[in-house]
């Protein structure tokens, strides 16, 4: 018997030493989120072991004090969803002794009314502001530096309107050092980990993003007042570009933020002359008045491969040559302002001759072609590593027109457990119909049945392999039936067996002494039930007539069937 697997908090994680009594579960939250509830649970011993407290949750708190702030993040309540109305949140950031703080603006999105963000250079509400959303239209791209070891952050929202709120990154830095840089949608490498004077940092962007403003390489300069010699760059999905890589990504302008209205963007993608291009359109969520066009060539006069408006699910296009031109025109009148509205296009260079285009490897899986040359009739089978499952068709065939019969599949992490099934003589309560990680199934036996095993199963993730139930499904066994009390032997007779208690299903046999005749049933049964009871009243032994006595000597013991075995309780 064990405790159920504790639920992983949203925006956090849990590590479990053991699910058996004495085992513990430790919870922690992602940066910017705080644990509400016990950080540490212990599995207590009982008939059904249980955790000594409820699982905690991770919340983006409305304010708080962060002492010894080194690097981290503060987010508004509800982030990345919208904040709620009528909030007044205060955060106090305090760097370790002798250090200062730098703030990066990861995201600030306030409703256009009386919602306000103020950042003060000090440790209280009276400290001078260094940023006030009322006063400043644009965010300072270089961020903010504290003069001492404190920043005081205020977020206030009124009773109308809501938006995504804010995410701020903070970094403490020592005397004689620069602060840790940050680039959204990108990465950086540093020559030294603590950023003393002389450190150089090189930035790069995620696929589909372009470095803008600032420099690719920056250096920590000035021993008297260490600072970066250039502004950190920004990575943005830009409108238009010429790409000559063999594989890459084209993103809608500003992705994943909404694209602007009235845009006309053109991207040219060029691969090696004897190759062609596979376009894998993974996300297409644009407005009905927006148009995305693919041209099979290097300008807008080329043949149109496809033209799309509105949303559309994952699809692929193949060019007939080594160039493709992608044009995106957004409606000048209306705009689709949702987060992750736009498009994500992955492109790959593929061979062009008498074979189907080369199929890429898929993450978390592998492919096996039926022959090395991808000629007509070749079959490619995709399989996934343990813990992943094929989404789409696992078998692709090279067709007469040298296209593949199906879209490229993917290997998706198996994020749910199999249905543990019904248990006979019980009902079950399900927290989520598709049994995702964290889902629970509770079994409750029908009346008259007893649970053997674990009442609650929890679906939990495993490092390797598919998610697994915390226990196997229980059984509901017929509860032990009470025995029947022994009946006394009739006068001038006997009973067999001579026990005081007879289990449900057992049979008792009666006989009479010589010269007596049995009146009633020679054998009676203990009928299972609540309570168990005898099938008939006990018989009596009546004196026989003298003639009868001599003539019926053979009847003085009633013939009885063999005693039946007790009922099988586990039916």
């Amino acid at each position: 018997l064990s405790c159920h697997f504790p639920r992983r908090p949203a925006y956090g994680d849990v590590t479990v030493t053991s699910l058996h009594p004495g085992g513990s579960a430790r919870f922690h939250c992602a940066t910017g989120y705080q644990l509400k509830g016990a950080r540490h649970l212990t599995c207590l011993n009982a008939t059904q072991p249980f955790w000594d407290s409820k699982e905690p949750v991770c919340i983006a708190a409305c304010g708080g004090v962060i002492r010894n702030a080194t690097t981290g993040r503060i987010v508004s309540p509800g982030f990345p969803g919208n904040y709620s109305n009528n909030l007044t949140c205060h955060w106090l950031l305090e760097a370790p002794e002798g250090q200062r703080l730098h703030l990066h603006f990861e995201k600030v999105s306030l409703a256009e009314d009386d919602d306000r963000l103020i950042i003060r250079n000090g440790d209280n509400v009276e400290a001078p502001p260094v940023y006030d959303s009322y006063e400043v239209e644009y965010l300072p791209i270089e961020g903010l530096l504290s003069s001492g070891k404190h920043f005081f952050v205020e977020l206030s929202t009124d009773s109308s309107g809501a938006a995504a709120g804010m995410a701020l990154r903070y970094e403490a830095f020592q005397q004689g050092h620069c602060y840790e840089p940050f680039v959204k949608y990108g990465n950086f490498s540093s020559s030294t980990p603590t950023y003393p004077v002389g450190t150089t940092v090189e930035f790069s962007c995620d696929p589909g993003y372009t470095l803008e403003q600032g420099s690719i390489i920056i250096e920590c300069v000035d021993p008297h007042d260490p600072q970066w010699n250039e502004t950190e760059p920004a990575c943005r999905a830009v409108c238009s570009g010429e790409i000559t890589d063999s594989a890459g990504v084209v993103l809608s302008p500003n992705w994943p933020e909404p694209y602007g209205r009235g845009q006309d963007c053109i991207w040219g993608v060029h691969v090696e002359e004897d190759k062609r291009i596979m376009l894998d359109i993974r996300v297409l969520r644009i407005g009905p008045g927006d148009v995305l066009t693919f041209y099979d060539g290097d300008d807008l006069t080329a043949r149109v491969l496809g033209q799309y408006s509105g949303p559309r699910s994952h699809f692929k296009l193949f060019t007939s040559m080594a160039d493709v031109t992608i044009q995106f025109q957004s409606d000048p009148g209306t705009s689709v302002l949702g987060y992750q509205q736009g498009f994500v296009i992955h492109f790959f260079e593929v061979p062009r001759n008498d074979t189907c285009p080369e199929l890429p490897e898929i993450p978390n899986g592998w492919k096996s072609p039926s022959q090395p040359e991808l000629v007509h009739g070749t079959v490619v089978t995709y399989q996934c590593y343990p813990g992943y499952q094929v989404v789409g068709s696992s078998v692709l065939m090279c067709q007469w027109d040298l296209t593949w019969s199906e879209d490229l599949p993917s290997c998706q992490r198996v994020t749910s457990c199999h249905d543990p099934g019904d248990v006979e003589h019980s009902r079950r309560l399900i927290s989520s119909p598709k049994f995702p990680v964290g889902a629970t199934v509770q079994y409750i036996c029908d009346q008259g049945f007893v649970l053997m095993g674990s009442s609650i199963l929890t679906c939990h993730d495993r490092q390797a392999g598919s998610p697994k139930w915390s226990d196997r499904a229980p059984k509901c066994l017929l509860e032990q039936l009470k025995p029947c009390h022994g009946l006394s032997a009739p006068e001038n007779g006997a009973r067999s067996p001579e026990k005081q208690l007879h289990p449900a299903g057992a049979t008792i046999h009666f006989s009479c002494a010589p010269g007596y005749v049995l009146k009633g049933q020679a054998s009676i049964k203990c009928v299972p039930g609540h309570p168990s009871h005898w099938s008939d009243p006990p018989p009596i032994c009546r004196a026989a007539s003298l003639d009868g006595f001599y003539n019926s000597r053979s009847l003085d013991v009633a013939k009885a069937p063999a005693a039946s075995s007790t009922l099988d309780a586990a039916h």
Epitope: S426, L429, I430, S431, T440, D446, Q447, G448, E479, H530
Partner: antibody, heavy 120, light 106 residues
């Protein structure tokens, strides 16, 4: 003292949805499953389903799957039942009920009932 | 699901009279529970686990039975006993109720 306080009567149009509530007091809400029972004009009683407020798990009578949805709001110790695509067959009194103990099989505590009338 | 048939559907009894009503199950059940309901009120748990009386239920009420046949008996009818009585089982899910026996005062 265990009390189950249900929301007031509802008059609905066919095809609409209705959501009724049952506020529990006098015991720890998350320690007991909450059951819902229908009593139609012919007076017969039918078990709709139950919800475990602690884990949010639900179990339904096959007959009411797709018709009823059970939810809870732990912090206010309130259980809810939503009925969708209402027809005249759904006109009835709906009770929330609790068993005496976690391991008992009879309904010891009942709400006062919510009368739902479906009429064009 | 198990069907419970209550009989009679309606009966009347004079004060002091002995009353017996029955509940027959379509399959064997382990226990039977009984509820009393008066017009315009919620059902009340009246007998549980076949024969046990909750506090507040008069001792003139008793329950018995096993397998498919169960009964509720009032040893001596009183005016306040006039109500509808429902039987209920949960030996098999879903739990089911009988259609009720309406007991009237003569």
């Amino acid at each position: 003292e265990v009390q189950l306080q249900q929301s007031g009567p509802e008059v609905m149009k066919p095809g609409a949805s209705v959501k009724m509530s049952c506020k529990a007091s006098g015991y720890t809400f998350t320690d007991y499953n909450m059951h819902w029972v229908k009593q139609n004009q012919g007076k017969s009683l039918e078990w709709i389903g139950e919800i475990n407020p602690n884990i949010g798990g639900t179990g339904y009578n096959q007959k009411f799957k797709g018709k009823a949805t059970l939810t809870v709001h732990k912090s206010s110790s309130t259980a809810y039942m939503e009925l969708r695509s209402l027809t005249s067959e759904d006109s009835a009194v709906y009770y929330c009920a609790r068993t005496y103990s976690y391991y008992s099989y009879e309904f010891a505590y009942w709400g006062q009932g919510t009368l739902v009338t479906v009429s064009a | 699901q198990i069907v419970l048939t209550q009989s009679p559907a309606i009966m009347s009894a004079s004060p002091g009279e002995k009353v017996t009503m029955t509940c027959s199950a379509s399959s064997s059940v382990s226990y039977m529970h009984w509820y009393q309901q008066k017009s315009g009120t919620s059902p009340k748990r009246w007998i549980y686990d076949t024969s046990k009386l909750p506090s507040g239920v008069p001792a003139r009420f008793s329950g018995s039975g096993s397998g498919t046949s169960y009964s509720l008996t009032i040893s001596s009818m009183e005016a306040e006993d006039a109500a509808t009585y429902y039987c209920q089982q949960w030996s098999s899910t879903p739990p089911t109720f009988g259609a009720g026996t309406k007991l009237e005062l003569k």
